[in-house]
Amino acid sequence: LIIGFGISGRHSITVTTVASAGNIGEDGILSCTFEPDIKLSDIVIQWLKEGVLGLVHEFKEGKDELSEQDEMFRGRTAVFADQVIVGNASLRLKNVQLTDAGTYKCYIITSKGKGNANLEYKTGAFSMPEVNVDYNASSETLRCEAPRWFPQPTVVWASQVDQGANFSEVSNTSFELNSENVTMKVVSVLYNVTINNTYSCMIENDIAKATGDIKVTESEIKRRSHLQLLNSKAS
């Protein structure tokens, strides 16, 4: 969480951002809130990016003002117009690109003052893994698949029964480049699994950590998946 305060001139207002991550090819949100004003005409929101000449986005006098928007963000940005009045300056970023990563500034002017806060935005790819029993294999085998990751993640297997065990000798992980030549499909196979045990396939890079669990018993198979972004720090 980054909290910024305005300086000089008018009173300062508090602006708060939260570091976040964008999943390339999908839509992302750059979070920013501020002390609200009661009338929309006095609120100015400017989003800037370090190293970029033009603006990322500007909202003033109740509408988007995009005449100075940088070309790389053209047609890809929007504020939540209905929530500006309550202090939400968050930016929706469409079709996140790898190059969107960097330091952003959320700069706010209201009738009460000015303020700004920076936000670190990471980009990459992350997806939920699915663990299945591989019935084609000669021995009891589990197959963990996740369609999109970048940068290349690490894959670690764990089990409820053999806590702390190292499964690297009995597992095999491969990374297959997807058609857009950036993200990769992750496939990890775990051999010699035993029944009545819960196995976890953990995939992690510097952006996200995802876990796929599978519990195999004689009568049923239970699955569960979980994904967590790693860098959600507020500012």
Epitope: K39, E61, G62, Q83, I85
Partner: antibody, heavy 117, light 107 residues
Framework: EVQLQQSGTVLARPGASVKMSCKAS????????MHWVKQRPGQGLEWIGA????????TYNQKFEGKAKLTAVTSDSTAYMDLSSLTNEDSAVYYC??????????WGQGTSVTVSS | ETVMTQSHKIMSTSVGDRVTITCKAS??????VAWYQQKPGQSPKLLIS???YQYTGVPDRFTGSGSGTDFTFTISSLQAEDLAVYYC?????????FGAGTKLELR
């Protein structure tokens, strides 16, 4: 769940003053504007003013400057409105309303004020 | 002061009708307009904000449009429970102002 609980009906004499309250719950009281709106019997809605409890900032409709005074006590998440020098024209229902997720999206049940000699 | 003019004080309608209420601002208020519903003895209830954004939990039959000075609120198919007074409200300038209200009653 966001709730705004207003104080009860008031009967007052002309020239007197009244103070009504609006207790907020279910959201961060200090982070959002609390507005006050007047509605005369059978009439429309009239904005009186608003207070930002986090900084005790107030903004008034010029028409109500000197008539209404807005305050807030952050420790118990309660906003107050004082109305002074009451006349028959002040007989109305007074609503508190906060802008939390959107424009004036939560409203109290209203406080009815009757000014009569 | 921005005056919000609702041209009809009362509108006679029937269940199933498409109802359109208009509101005209005396000056440009961009899209900073909300619409409220008020039933007798109740507090106003937010239906639409920023001229066209439906508030959480509001039925799809309620829609809003417009920008600048001309705004429209529409009920696509009137239900009996929609009989109420509807107010437009601008929050672009202070003082914040409301329209005089449009009452929907059965024909």
């Amino acid at each position: 769940e966001v709730q705004l609980q207003q104080s009860g009906t008031v009967l007052a004499r002309p020239g007197a003053s009244v103070k009504m309250s609006c207790k907020a719950s279910g959201y961060t009281f200090t982070s959002y504007w609390m507005h006050w709106v007047k509605q005369r019997p059978g009439q429309g809605l009239e904005w009186i003013g608003a207070i930002y409890p986090g900084k005790s900032d107030t903004t008034y409709n010029q028409k109500f400057e000197g008539k209404a005074k807005l305050t807030a006590v952050t420790s118990d998440s309660t906003a107050y409105m004082d109305l002074s020098s009451l006349t028959n024209e002040d007989s109305a229902v007074y609503y508190c309303t906060s802008s939390v997720r959107n424009a004036m999206d939560y409203w109290g049940q209203g406080t009815s004020v009757t000014v009569s000699s | 002061e921005t005056v919000m003019t609702q041209s009809h004080k009362i509108m006679s309608t029937s269940v199933g009708d498409r109802v359109t209420i208009t509101c005209k601002a005396s000056q440009d208020v961009r899209t900073a307009v909300a619409w409220y519903q008020q039933k007798p003895g109740q507090s106003p209830k937010l239906l639409i904000s920023s001229a066209s954004y439906q508030y959480t939990g509001v039925p799809d039959r309620f829609t809003g449009s417009g920008s600048g000075t001309d705004f429209t609120f529409t009920i696509s198919s009137l239900q009996a429970e929609d009989l109420a007074v509807y107010y437009c409200h601008q929050y672009y300038n202070t003082p914040l102002t409301f329209g005089a209200g449009t009452k929907l009653e059965l024909r």
